[in-house]
Amino acid sequence: GAAEGVQIQIIYFNLETVQVTWNASKYSRTNLTFHYRFNGDEAYDQCTNYLLQEGHTSGCLLDAEQRDDILYFSIRNGTHPVFTASRWMVYYLKPSSPKHVRFSWHQDAVTVTCSDLSYGDLLYEVQYRSPFDTEWQSKQENTCNVTIEGLDAEKCYSFWVRVKAMEDVYGPDTYPSDWSEVTCWQRGEIRDACAETPTPPKPKLSK
């Protein structure tokens, strides 16, 4: 949101670290300070881990392991508060990128699995395409166990996976995780890449 020309962004990385960044055109050459507390009755602490942009403070990283409570914060120019707010941190969740992604092939289907995150109300999304496809196809499940059927064993497919917070649970302000690395598969075997120009299918041998 904008306040006194200050744009604020909050990201709660995997329920571990909160990043609050600001973009204040009015204070572009100023080292604004960030003060915070997790309890409305406590005194504010000052940030000890600032993010810098062009030599000036532009954000703060806070350790906030598995917290679903309110972050109170004040961005100040000297002693003057430029923006003061409180936010429920969990509504700005960005899950971590999927880890230990595995592919299990069975004929024209593949099951993509990865390590489930320790908290719930997430969607695990697999996107895939072959060079024949004009856009990515997508399938998602509540756990990291996604089976995609109807694939052509002769085609090369690119896959990547990400995690999203359910909007009906966490609201509209979460962020999807970064995508996992793209992996390419053909005939149940991993490939370095899928050729941009589709290779013609091998001729079927007559019996």
């Epitope: 949101g1 309110i70 923006f83 969990v90 302000d173």
Partner: antibody
Framework: EVQLLESGGGLVQPGGSLRLSCAAS????????MHWVRQAPGKGLKWVSS????????YYADSVKGRFTISRDNPKNTLYLQMNSLRAEDTAVYYC???????????WGQGTLVTVSS | DIQMTQSPSSLSASVGDRVTITCRAS??????LAWFQQKPGKAPKSLIY???SLQSGVPSKFSGSGSGTDFTLTISSLQPEDFATYYC?????????FGQGTKVEIK
């Protein structure tokens, strides 16, 4: 469909206690912060208390701090407000409210009336 | 605490009228402002959040605007079901606080 159903209101003498309940359904209760808001007869709305999804974070208006306790039982999808040392000025309809992040106080229960009088 | 001041406190209008209610915050609240409608004997209903976003299922005759300290709620064409009390609320900074309400009555 989100539903919030308050109960436990009634007539109580000054200094007495009351426990309000709010049965929630239609959403993932354990992940949602929840609130109590009250409205004295013929008056406006006043925030009373909030609790985080896990129940670890609790917040109170100065007027009720030390007398009221907010809590939740996530397996039972129920929110509570324990009200002690009640005063005449606590007389109000008490609403249970769901937090929606930037969507604010997005769903409200129908309310339960608490009357503190001798 | 942040004070929220609504004006007017009451107004009389006719069906079909365009109605505007204003809300002023005692300090900058960005766009973390909500509007609620309350009918007699009923619970408040959320109409608008983050100053201008319509809650799901709310008709487009309701609109909100503003940022910082000054906000407005507009009902483009008042209908019989819109006669009610309207409250603004800031939720930028705890504790959340409400305006005193604006009662919209039939002229």
């Amino acid at each position: 469909e989100v539903q919030l159903l308050e109960s436990g209101g009634g007539l109580v003498q000054p200094g007495g206690s009351l426990r309000l309940s709010c049965a929630a359904s239609g959403f993932t209760f354990r992940s949602s912060a929840m609130h109590w808001v009250r409205q004295a007869p013929g008056k406006g709305l006043k925030w009373v208390s909030s609790v985080s999804g896990s129940g670890a974070g609790t917040y109170y208006a100065d007027s009720v701090k030390g007398r009221f306790t907010i809590s939740r039982d996530n397996p039972k999808n129920t929110l509570y407000l324990q009200m002690n040392s009640l005063r005449a000025e606590d007389t109000a309809v008490y609403y249970c409210v769901k937090e929606g992040g930037s969507r604010g106080f997005d769903y409200w229960g129908q309310g339960t009336l608490v009357t503190v009088s001798s | 605490d942040i004070q929220m001041t609504q004006s007017p406190s009451s107004l009389s209008a006719s069906v079909g009228d365009r109605v505007t209610i204003t809300c002023r915050a005692s300090q900058d609240i960005s766009n973390y402002l909500a509007w609620f409608q309350q009918k007699p004997g009923k619970a408040p209903k959320s109409l608008i959040y983050t100053a201008s976003s319509l809650q799901s299922g709310v008709p487009s005759k309701f609109s909100g605007s503003g940022s910082g300290t000054d906000f407005t709620l507009t009902i483009s064409s008042l209908q019989p079901e819109d006669f009610a009390t309207y409250y603004c609320q800031q939720y930028n900074l705890y504790p959340p606080t409400f305006g005193q309400g604006t009662k919209v009555e039939i002229k």
